[in-house]
């Protein structure tokens, strides 16, 4: 904590300017009025303060705004944003995309994923939903940031906005996020022709249920192995060898390379070895001929 002292008369601050870089920490604390700092935040980023000095300025703002900074201050934080913790950001109410852009630019190149995720979350809450302008801003200034949002926040994305999402924006999305985004994508792209539809839906397929994957296998899409490997394990397991062969088309040979990785490994274990042999890939680990398969999941559901 910064030690409290009285400000020497000759050090009194009437304006936020470059002269402040020569102030010691305790002088900044004693001489800078928090209300003046807040009113002239737009000048702070142009002044080459040390990180220690920025700590003092943050402390003054925290005292002035214990419930969280107003957006007029947040917008002009500049490099002071690097001092913010997710707990600080959680108190904010942000609605302006200009504010979001400014802070995303500042955070670039710094390890601030938790802060950025919290900031985006506050923007979505502030704006009421993840609208097209917000998605466009995220994809332009922070590729991959979409996936930092919780499934609950992503549920506010209108299907009409899904077209603005690019494949690379989904690279870091986990299954729970794709579960939310996939049905929206399916709704958004449902009026497209088969081949165009597959191109659009492919990045979202990690959230697809079994029936959709089965239906895709009837459409000669020739799914690449990378997409297949991102499918939900639960969506892949019920597929027959014939369905996987039709789904992958010429890419079926890639199963051999992925033989030891999920979901391929788990799928192999559920297939009859005789059926696997028809692929001619030398896949091993299937159910030996003559064994009886009991589907206990269905039996449990019926009991």
């Amino acid at each position: 904590d910064v030690e409290r002292t009285t400000c020497p008369p000759e050090k009194e601050v009437h304006e936020i300017d470059e002269s402040l870089i020569f102030y010691k920490k305790r002088e900044l604390e004693a001489c800078v009025d928090a209300a003046l700092l807040a009113a002239q935040m737009d000048r702070v980023d142009a002044i080459p303060f040390t990180y220690e000095q920025l700590d003092v300025l943050k402390h003054k703002l925290d005292e002035l705004y214990p419930q969280g900074y107003p957006e007029s201050v947040i917008r002009h934080l500049g490099h002071l944003f690097l001092k913010m913790s997710p707990e600080d950001i959680r108190k904010w109410n942000v609605t302006s995309l200009e504010t979001l852009k400014a802070l995303l630019k500042v955070s670039k190149g710094h390890e601030m994923s938790a802060q950025v995720a919290t900031l985006i979350d506050r923007v979505v809450v502030g704006r009421g939903q993840l609208d097209k302008d917000t998605v466009d801003t995220l994809t332009a200034f922070c590729p991959g940031c979409l996936c930092s949002l919780s499934p609950e926040r992503l549920s506010s994305v209108p299907p009409s906005v899904i077209g603005a999402v690019r494949p690379q924006d989904l690279d870091t999305c986990g299954p729970r996020q794709l579960d939310v985004l996939y049905p929206k994508a399916r709704l958004a792209f449902q009026n497209m022709s088969g081949s165009e539809y597959f191109v659009k839906i492919r990045p979202f397929l990690g959230g697809a249920p079994t029936e959709d994957v089965k239906a895709l296998s009837q459409q000669n899409v020739s799914m690449d192995l990378a997409t297949f490997m991102k499918l939900r394990r639960e969506a892949v397991l019920p597929l027959t060898v014939a369905e996987v062969q039709k789904l992958l088309g010429p890419h079926v040979e890639g199963l051999k390379v992925e033989e030891q990785h999920s979901p391929v490994r788990d799928w192999i274990l559920k297939q009859r070895q005789d059926d696997l042999d028809t692929l001619g890939l030398g896949l091993q680990g299937g159910i030996p001929n003559g064994y009886l398969i009991l589907d206990l999941s269905v039996r449990e559901a019926l009991s």
Partner: antibody, heavy 122, light 107 residues
């Protein structure tokens, strides 16, 4: 073949929470999206919302603040909770399977439960 | 939300005759429309999806047409079991919405 069966109390008091469960038998809950649809006596159908087995949901904005849809994959069941009910929530509540396969690309219902009448009254 | 309006509210037709039911959307739903049949005390039954594709097991006398905002369900030669309430449903956007229904009764 797959069958759906709704269960829950037929009478709920105003301001309380309506709770219903749909049991999916004859198939896995993991393969599809599952919805709740209701029909007030003598009136039309209203979609309440859907759930995926992972717990991902989408609800009708007109009811969203009062609706919780959840899933229990171990029991092959999904449930509806509707809070702060009034007489206007009196309806036959159906659980239904949303087809929506890519082959036909859509969100409509090819399988329905028989429905259960829930009356809101003190 | 997209409002679906069905007409007429009630349609009286003699067995063996043709019945034509209409459904109008407040904005375009492309061909993302389904039709259901509901008999008293029963759940709805899917008849048509994609505006014109018959669901599995639905007799050929049921046909659907239309695109955009105007849709029609036609039953070419009414059988006694066809007298019921019919609903249209759009799935072009959430929330999914239904028409208020057309009651088809025996004349």
């Amino acid at each position: 073949q797959v069958q759906l069966q709704e269960s829950g109390p037929g009478l709920v008091k105003p301001s309380e929470t309506l709770s219903l469960t749909c049991t999916v038998s004859g198939g896995s809950i993991q393969n599809y999206y599952w919805s709740w649809v209701r029909q007030p006596p003598g009136k039309g159908l209203e979609w309440i919302g859907y759930i995926f087995y992972s717990g991902s949901t989408q609800s009708n904005p007109s009811l969203k603040s009062r609706v919780i849809i959840s899933v229990d994959t171990s029991k092959n069941q999904f449930s509806l909770k509707l809070s702060s009910v009034t007489a206007a929530d009196t309806a036959v509540y159906y659980c239904a399977r949303e087809v929506g396969r890519i082959a036909v690309a859509g969100w409509f219902f090819d399988l329905w439960g028989r429905g259960t009448l829930v009356t809101v009254s003190s | 939300e997209i409002v679906m309006t069905q007409s007429p509210a009630t349609l009286s037709v003699s067995p063996g005759e043709r019945a034509t039911l209409s459904c109008r959307a407040s904005q375009s739903v492309n061909a993302n429309l389904a039709w259901y049949q509901q008999k008293p005390g029963q759940a709805p039954r899917l008849l048509i999806y994609g505006a014109s594709t018959r669901a599995t097991g639905i007799p050929a006398r049921f046909s659907g047409s239309g695109s955009g905002t105007e849709f029609t369900l036609t039953i070419s030669s009414l059988q006694s079991e066809d007298f019921a309430v019919y609903y249209c449903q759009q799935y072009n956007n959430w929330p999914l919405t239904f028409g208020q229904g057309t009651r088809l009764e025996i004349k």
